[in-house]
Interface confidence: low
Amino acid sequence: ASVGLPSVSLDLPRLSIQKDILTIKANTTLQITCRGQRDLDWLWPNNQSGSEQRVEVTECSDGLFCKTLTIPKVIGNDTGAYKCFYRETDLASVIYVYVQDYRSPFIASVSDQHGVVYITENKNKTVVIPCLGSISNLNVSLCARYPEKRFVPDGNRISWDSKKGFTIPSYMISYAGMVFCEAKINDESYQSIMYIVVVVGYRIYDVVLSPSHGIELSVGEKLVLNCTARTELNVGIDFNWEYPSSKHQHKKLVNRDLKTQSGSEMKKFLSTLTIDGVTRSDQGLYTCAASSGLMTKKNSTFVRVHEKPFVAFGSGMESLVEATVGERVRIPAKYLGYPPPEIKWYKNGIPLESNHTIKAGHVLTIMEVSERDTGNYTVILTNPISKEKQSHVVSLVVYVPPQIGEKSLISPVDSYQYGTTQTLTCTVYAIPPPHHIHWYWQLEEECANEPSQAVSVTNPYPCEEWRSVEDFQGGNKIEVNKNQFALIEGKNKTVSTLVIQAANVSALYKCEAVNKVGRGERVISFHVTRGPEITLQPDMQPTEQESVSLWCTADRSTFENLTWYKLGPQPLPIHVGELPTPVCKNLDTLWKLNATMFSNSTNDILIMELKNASLQDQGDYVCLAQDRKTKKRHCVVRQLTVLERVAPTITGNLENQTTSIGESIEVSCTASGNPPPQIMWFKDNETLVEDSGIVLKDGNRNLTIRRVRKEDEGLYTCQACSVLGCAKVEAFFIIEGAQEKTNLE
């Protein structure tokens, strides 16, 4: 057989025995001559060098570049490949010689005592037990112990080859401590040497780097990276690191096995990379690879090296954040810095502490943003080493979708007297203010008599055919007033009013307000009745503990049996076709009330008096009257709202101020409460008296001091009082400059 590629000028060495395989008997002499075109050498089995005593290599007598190999009295162990080759080349000729020794059919290894085979428990791996044969066609089996098991070649995954040995799937013998090959020749058994079985693991479960990410250092600091490999038992691990700067003088690698708990099914290996003083060139990706021979796993981390400790805001740090009421707001402090800075958040100068509604950390999170969260938030980053500080202001604007104030107040069944002029109002609060408020209408019967439409409590008006109020044909004559802006409960609100010049037809009116973040609407049932009329005495919403009377007036010639009822607490049942005054047909939901009857020349008046009204008295009151002729019942409903008593509060602060002599001071003090509080002003705890220079306007809300003098300096107090108590705010006014002397002195 030939080995290597023939070069242009050299032929392969030529052997005297022109065969690939030669079979000879033991105790005979093996002699092969090799001829070539330059210096030759021989290699033979077992001892692959020229030191074997029994083997003789001699120069041929008949020519240059010729060598004869002679082995007298060959034995089975001389079985193997004999190679003749040109020195310093790959060009060779090979013959495989079997020395048939039936007393020793297996070639013994040089170490003779026993061999070692390394196996893994991998199902797909096979192992070769190197029991080579001196006879090519032996009947060989493999014995494993203990317990004793015999494996016979199956023509598939179990086989024996005289030149290679016994091949078997490794998991089949992984239980065994030792194995050997056995050959049967003429009912005689011959055994190879014993091979000790060593099970070697290969599985790497994971490779973990610590720290795993976000590693930052400044020049000169020490970098320590730990790489831990977790493996199955019987595994040996090689670690290999890749890093940016390979030429580092102060780089140190330490590999060691880590102890695991006894009985653990796992081994741990640790490789520690240390760089004593990092430089900028050490910045980059660090990769640790752990290899078990059959398996490699790796992990990487990025190491950032800064010139020196620093802190700065990232370019994406927002200056304006917009949100809608109820949303979760996240304002991340986007920074570049090493080491990570201490982060402190302030709102309008006041430090923010985390609680269940707000988390002030790397990200400022407001769980459910409300209007009061609007403002300027300052984030201050402090470098913990250099103490360098950076601050950034973020303005948070909280938008409010339109909210219509009266929506929760008005009963869906209010009634209006025929022929009267009525004003419908929508008071809208929205941020930003609504860019439009539109009014729509439709006839009550168009909406109410739509049996196919399902009616719900949230949408008692299933109708969709809304018409613009400009198109009032077939309805009431309407005029929409220009929107007004009013400060109500300390909030800027938009008030839209719609004037119905004569209440002739029952209709539904809808106002719709829209701003950039949403829309709000309110549907008003405008039920026109020719029946009784309800009025309130006094003609305003009562406050708790005040008295109020509800008057029901009906034409005596038309109506009789006037009765007052109150709607029960359960929601008004609404039936399709009966909207919006179903109360007369469903008296079960009403509570009958005691009332006093008065009469004048034309009307009966039924008066129901509430002394010391309470919040429980709020609700829908129904006056029922019966038509004298038809006996048909007519109902009118009036919703009564009782205002809660609220102690006085003053919105906004009085500011200390410094003014020069001769200038003017104007301050205002807005108070709220129910009943409305009285406002009084004091200077240095004495009641402030109006004179030519001191002017109080708008119910004492606004104080003006004209042409201030030195004696106007002092502590000014605004006090708002009602029966529920007082609230006050104070400010000190400093007057600068010298008082000019007047001629009068």
């Epitope: 990410h213 950032r304 990232g314 994406g316 986007k334 570049l336």
Partner: antibody, heavy 120, light 111 residues
């Protein structure tokens, strides 16, 4: 040294999904965001979206539903879910190596681009 | 989304001269604007970020400025190598949008 290289650009028929891959070198994707920008022949640059260091994705309003960005430890993929002829362009992946974290702002490292042609 | 409107192409300048390119934002984006240079068949190159900060390795002949929502890129001491298309890009993320927009581009011709 940080570098980006796009691959996967080829001629596709309309409606055939196509995935482009950006292979990064020297950049830790767990610390940096990566973005995609495209440029139709003879036209200007158009921002598609980016994937943050934590894996959150952000898309231009026109790109939502049309593209999907995902990543492994060393690659960032851009999937064009149902290409149309209007998606014919050179696609660049880009990164800001100076400004790592949740958002991708301006781009100071760009790949050479890969050409996608959508034609029936 | 922010819309960026750039100076119409082309803008011409002589070698050694100065050219300015404007970029108008449709809403407040503060200083969140970058400028890029792109030559035919090449990838874009960052010149300016944060409206006026010079990117590393960019000659000081390039400068950026901001006035409200109008941004300007100025190239002074013009060289032949400056012939390219210049793009502005906003990277302002508001609560309802993460649109990161490029302007339409302005071609600079050097005579």
């Amino acid at each position: 040294c940080q570098s980006l290289e796009e691959s996967g650009g080829r001629l596709v028929t309309p409606g055939t999904p196509l995935t482009l891959t950006c292979t990064v070198s020297g950049i830790d994707l767990s610390s940096y965001a990566m973005g995609w920008v495209r440029q139709a022949p003879g036209k200007g640059l158009e921002w598609i979206g980016f994937i943050s260091s934590s894996g959150s994705t952000y898309y231009a309003s026109w790109a939502k539903g049309r593209f999907t960005i995902s990543k492994t430890s060393t690659t960032v993929d851009l999937k064009i879910t149902s290409p149309t002829t209007e998606d014919t362009a050179t696609y660049f992946c880009a990164n800001n190596y100076d400004d790592y974290g949740d958002f991708l702002h301006y781009f100071n490292i760009w790949g050479p681009g890969t050409l996608v042609t959508v034609s029936s | 989304a922010v819309v960026l409107t750039q100076t119409a192409s082309p803008v011409s300048g002589a070698v050694g001269g100065t050219v300015t390119i404007k970029c108008q934002a449709s809403q407040h984006i503060y200083s969140n604007l970058a400028w890029y240079q792109q030559k035919p068949g090449q990838r874009p190159k960052l010149l300016i970020y944060a409206a006026s900060k010079l990117a590393s390795g960019v000659p000081s002949r390039f400068s950026g400025s901001r006035s409200g929502t109008e941004f300007t890129l100025t190239i002074s001491d013009l060289e032949c190598a400056d012939a390219a298309t210049y793009y502005c890009q906003s990277y302002y993320y508001s609560s309802d949008s993460t649109d990161n927009t490029f302007g339409g581009g302005t071609e600079v011709v050097v005579k």
